[in-house]
């Protein structure tokens, strides 16, 4: 059962796993949610009745029954983890804590103009977990405006104390605001020879990489595959760090794979969600329950629905045994990973999907698309919406993309002459315009947010957000697309598609069926040559065939240029402008979304 509210002056008795320090009960709840075993917590707020050494303690707790006895205690705040909840969860914490000093290893000290600048510095520093900033009112002159970057083994402070005229806060890496590079490559036959901060068991290098990503101290990893010569090290995932933030030595070793933490690309790839099944593989761990199940998929469902289950092993039924049902072993461990992985015993293993909600919804795999053809099929582009105006009559105005459960990203130029958001209607999950009838449900628009530097499409900043009046329930036919990570600026996308209901030639009409076209990206230098009368800025991105023939056109505006990278679709561009449609040597010009990620997050995450 999902309980989100906090219980004031209440303490949960027993069940302690560990104690950490957090600046608020709200953040204690987040820490509990991300901890592999924590189901409940008790936080101690600052209070004259409480020993100051206990202030800001966050005691993480577990219980077989998923609850613990409650005791009245002043200044104690208790609650439950969000593991029990189905809603989207984020570790992003933008709060600034006034007059609090969050203790950790102070590894970098520099002058900063403001707390915001200090937080940005922390976000863009590979080691930084949190910071403390001495304001200009700080008593000690030599410490004023000093920005201390800090890290700890756990990612949370080792202690928190009251200190006048300082402010503290966390790195915003988990808010997708870091400019650090996102290196997705996994290097085969490579060992990174740096200090290990931890080791866990993992079935493959991808899971190892994801574990590294959400481990606070891990910057890169080495994984020994099941063919690794040393038996005791098979399936071992070594979590590593170094002072420079990069591996100091790479050793060529067969059957080992290495890679980097995906911290800077967390918003556009799954990090917590290990959805694969591992055949002929047994995961060992503490047994939670053994239940009968028809298949390994059913077993995974059982594990997902059991809040304490972290992973499972399914042993298929022997012929005609137990009505064809196999045994489903639900398991857990102290760190969420198997204590040992065995092969050749016939089991099928996997992980709970409960943690998938900690990943961005946009990373969910969508159904395979039909290759070739220009008409789309239902569910092929579930983020694509059709934006209708009711003035003078109801009609398709522009395309748009779902980027959040209340947010559509589109082009600013779509709103020329639109006097009010009330006259707009957003339809999602639509394949054919003819499906839209008077009684078709739609999302009303609460607010149109146009980039304040927008003047006209050709001069850039052609980007707008629509805040919907109600939230979108994600389904197979309507779900968000990932924004590109700022750390992905140098990625070369090779699988890009433009979609929309727009014209198929310059003098035409809106199409009934959603059209799609695969279009190659064109460098900005090349694009500039084709548009000598315009300035193609780095905030624009171009796509098109040299010979023309495939392009976006009137009515496609505001829609997505979607590129698939590492099995995840990213909103790389917003259809903006071009000379004619599909003309030879006249590529389409799109708003370069990666350059607006900060703007998007600022507008969509505003309180």
């Amino acid at each position: 059962e999902c309980v989100t509210q906090l219980l004031k002056d209440t303490c949960f008795e027993g069940g302690d796993i560990t104690t950490v320090f957090t600046p608020s009960a709200k953040y204690c709840q987040v820490v509990c949610t991300y901890h592999p075993r924590c189901l409940l917590f008790t936080f101690t707020a600052e209070s004259p009745s409480e020993d100051p050494t206990r202030w800001f303690t966050c005691v993480l707790k577990d219980s077989v029954t998923e609850t613990l006895p409650r005791v009245n205690r002043t200044a104690a705040i208790s609650g439950y983890s969000f593991k029990q909840c189905s809603h989207q969860i984020s570790a992003c914490n933008k709060d600034i804590y006034v007059d609090l000093d969050m203790k950790g290893i102070n590894y970098n000290s520099s002058v900063a103009k403001s707390a915001q600048e200090c937080q940005e510095r922390c976000t863009d520093d590979v080691h930084c977990h949190f910071f403390t900033y001495a304001t200009r009112q700080f008593p000690s002159l030599e410490h004023r405006n000093i920005c201390l970057l800090k890290h700890t083994q756990t990612g949370t402070p080792t202690r928190i104390t009251k200190l006048d005229k300082v402010v503290s806060g966390f790195s915003l890496k988990s808010c997708a605001l870091s400019n650090l590079a996102c290196i997705r490559d996994i290097f085969p036959n490579t060992v990174f020879a740096d200090s290990n901060i931890d080791s866990v068991m993992a079935p493959d290098a991808f899971v190892c990489g994801r574990i590294c990503t959400h481990h606070p101290g891990c910057l890169f990893f080495t994984f020994f595959s099941q063919e690794w010569p040393k038996e005791s090290q098979r399936n071992l995932c070594l979590l590593k760090t170094s002072e420079s933030g990069l591996p100091s030595t790479r050793i060529k070793k067969s059957k080992a794979l290495s890679g980097f933490s995906l911290q800077s690309c967390r918003h556009s790839i799954p990090v917590f969600c290990h959805s694969s099944f591992y055949h002929d593989t047994d995961f060992l761990g503490e047994e939670l329950d053994i239940v009968a199940a028809k298949s390994h998929e059913a077993c995974q469902k059982l594990c997902t629905n059991a809040v304490r289950c972290q992973f499972f092993t399914y042993t298929p039924a022997q012929a005609s045994c137990n009505e064809g049902k196999g045994k489903c072993y639900l398991k857990l461990s102290s760190n969420g990973s198997p204590t040992k992985i065995l092969h050749g015993r016939g089991g099928i293993s996997g992980y709970t999907l409960r943690l998938c909600k900690m990943d961005n919804e946009c990373t969910t795999k969508i159904k395979p698309r039909i290759v070739g053809g220009t008409a789309s099929v239902r569910g092929e582009w579930p983020w694509q919406v059709t934006l209708h105006t009711t003035s003078p009559t109801q009609r398709h105005l522009c395309g748009g993309s779902i980027i959040g459960n209340q947010w559509i990203l589109t082009a600013a130029h779509c709103f020329y002459g639109v006097e009010s958001p009330k006259i707009l209607r957003v339809y999602s999950g639509i394949l054919n315009q003819s499906e839209i009838k008077e009684d078709t449900s739609f999302f009303g628009v609460q607010e149109i947010i146009i980039h304040d530097q927008y003047k006209m499409a050709e001069s850039g900043y052609d980007i707008a957000l629509l805040k919907l009046e109600t939230t979108v329930n994600y389904t197979d036919s309507q779900r968000p697309i990932c924004l590109p990570s700022k750390g992905d600026r140098n990625v070369i996308y090779t699988d890009c598609w433009v979609t929309g209901w727009g014209y198929r030639k310059l003098r035409d009409k809106i199409q009934n069926t959603l059209q799609k076209a695969k279009i190659p990206l064109v460098t900005n230098e090349e694009c500039q040559k084709r548009y000598r009368g315009h300035k193609i800025t780095h905030k624009m991105i171009c796509a098109g065939y040299r010979e023309g023939g495939k392009d976006a056109c009137k009515g496609d505006s505001g829609g997505p240029l979607s590129c698939k990278h590492n099995e995840v679709w990213h909103l790389v561009g917003i259809t903006s402008w071009g000379e004619g449609c599909a003309q030879r040597e006249r590529p389409g010009v799109y708003t370069n979304v990666v350059e607006y990620v900060d703007w998007i997050l600022e507008k969509t995450q505003a309180v």
């Epitope: 003078p392 109801q394 009010s420 009330k422 006259i423």
Partner: antibody, heavy 117, light 107 residues
Framework: QVQLVQSGSELKKPGASVKLSCKAS????????MHWVKQAPGQGLEWIGN????????NYDEKFRTRATLTADTSTSTAYMELSSLRSEDTAVYYC??????????WGQGTTVTVSS | NIVMTQSPSSLSASVGDRVTITCKAS??????VSWFQQKPGQAPKLLIY???NRYTGVPDRFSGSGSATDFTLTISSLQAEDVADYHC?????????FGQGTKLEIK
Amino acid sequence: QVQLVQSGSELKKPGASVKLSCKASGYTFTRYWMHWVKQAPGQGLEWIGNIYPDSDSTNYDEKFRTRATLTADTSTSTAYMELSSLRSEDTAVYYCTRMGFYAMDYWGQGTTVTVSS
Amino acid sequence: NIVMTQSPSSLSASVGDRVTITCKASENVVTYVSWFQQKPGQAPKLLIYGASNRYTGVPDRFSGSGSATDFTLTISSLQAEDVADYHCGQSYSYPLTFGQGTKLEIK
């Protein structure tokens, strides 16, 4: 069922103003544009303007912009058109009509305005 | 402003005749054209929307066709009750405009 009921006939002197009403029922008044159309005796239809009751957004034909004022009262689901500085050529039947999904699908019965000294 | 030119301004036909009324737009209005029927002393009634879609309850002898600038209303077999004025109108862009109307009579 959808109904638009307009106020009764008006006889006005040149230079005066007239305010016509159109009471809507049977649908969500705030979600549809309400248009006003003029039909002079023996003539065709002439568009005056429209209003979106949910936001009070309006559009007018240039010819009527300075003299016609469209308003809506969402509490009573009533649209109004006020026409000022009346002259003899304003003698006509005035219709309110709802812009449905694709077209003007429901019309009021019309209000006759006669301007005569 | 988009001008809608309707022709003929009046026409007389016999019961059972096929009747055609045309409307020409001064610029491309895609298919944002409607046809209305107005009987004496009554308000206009919607017949056709989107150039070719018959409105609910309209007899199937009425049909519409055309796109861009040329539009047609056809009555496949004229009935006595079809005596009325017929108006075309465009809702592609502001200001909305109508044709001058066609008076249809029975011979």
